[in-house]
């Protein structure tokens, strides 16, 4: 009876996500068969989040809208480990929008999910950010410095990275 009600709950939760994510890839968390964590297929997972590399070229605002339609946001990078994971899936000759913008052009950077901007956990390329009307951030590869962030115009179409919390069923 307990297993039946758990299964019913799982199915109703899966139905919630079915509209945007018809297929989920789930793994068992820990030793308890009751706990599964899922990411939409073919998103990748790291710690408690799922990531999707969008290869369509869009402006920052459209990229964020695109992520939100999928129940995600443009990526918020919280640690060096997280960035190191993300870059494994990026192409060196491309740039990708992050969920980081400076709408006022006053170098008051803000993350899309309201995570406080911490200057100590940023990975700007040297000399960046460098331009008050470049109000959106990308991650890209520079041969001298490897992967890092750069400020660019928000209206320039780029690829992007979406991030959402894992789905627990």
């Amino acid at each position: 009876n307990f297993m039946y009600s758990k299964t019913v709950k799982r199915l109703s939760k899966l139905r919630e996500y079915q509209q945007y994510h018809p297929s989920l890839t789930c793994v068992m968390e820990g030793k308890d068969i009751e706990d599964w964590s899922c990411c939409p297929t073919p998103w990748t997972s790291f710690q408690s989040s799922c990531y999707f590399i969008s290869t369509g070229m869009q402006s920052w605002t459209k990229s964020q809208k695109n992520c939100s339609v999928m129940g995600a946001d443009l990526v918020v990078i919280n640690t060096r480990e997280e960035q190191d994971f993300i870059i494994q899936n990026l192409k060196r000759n491309s740039s990708y929008f992050l969920g980081l913008s400076d709408p006022g052009g006053r170098r008051h950077w803000q993350w899309v999910d309201q995570t406080p901007y911490n200057e100590n956990v940023t990975f700007w390329h040297s000399g960046e950010p460098n331009n008050l009307d470049e109000r959106c951030a990308i991650i890209n590869f520079r041969s001298s410095e490897e992967w890092g962030w750069n400020d660019i115009h928000c209206h320039v179409p780029q690829k992007s990275i979406c991030k959402m919390k894992k789905i627990y069923i």
């Epitope: 605002t61 709408p103 052009g105 109000r135 115009h153 928000c154 209206h155």
Partner: antibody, heavy 123, light 111 residues
Amino acid sequence: EVQLVESGGGLVKPGGSLRLSCAASGFTFSSYTMSWVRQAPGKGLEWVAYISSGGGQTYYPDSVKGRFTISRDNAKNSLYLQMNSLRAEDTAVYYCARHDYYEGGLYYAMDYWGQGTLVTVSS
Amino acid sequence: DIVMTQSPDSLAVSLGERATINCKSSQSVDYDGDSSMNWYQQKPGQPPKLLIYAASTLESGVPSRFSGSGSGTDFTLTISSLQAEDVATYYCQQTNEDPPTFGGGTKVEIK
């Protein structure tokens, strides 16, 4: 007073080249993204190119990509448009315009325009 | 590219009457409550002049008879009481995504 003055237009044969200049004054030129916008005789406005304030970013529509090059010299408060492989359909008045980003926003408008310089491509 | 469609192509209005110009974008040009819609006025033989930015904010020095409204894909420029000096062609423009694109223009004349 903000002023933008274009020069360098004229008559050129198809396949020829021309370099337009825009002299800026009355504002801190090095702080602004700049654009070239053109208008064919009796027609509407068509954006041609822009360049970021430091010159690191340039962008072009497909209609001119590979033929036109925008550049700037912040020390001289000058904007340039090098036009190669010119075609009859490039005939237009070319305006330089300044981008001004909305206060507290991610978007911009073109708040100052020069008087324009006429480019005629004809054999 | 985002296509901007203006209507009507031309408009004849009596002095002191209201003139309304519409602009429709092929996709939304909004984000987080802001619109990347601008309106310009161009008089014969002159460069364009910025009238309204962010859909509804009047540029400094522009008479208050000009107003802008709309969001998403549908925008309107209104001249509440047409004056002789308002005879011009009016253009809408989006700057949400490159390339920035203009509408085809609406020519306003006096009836």
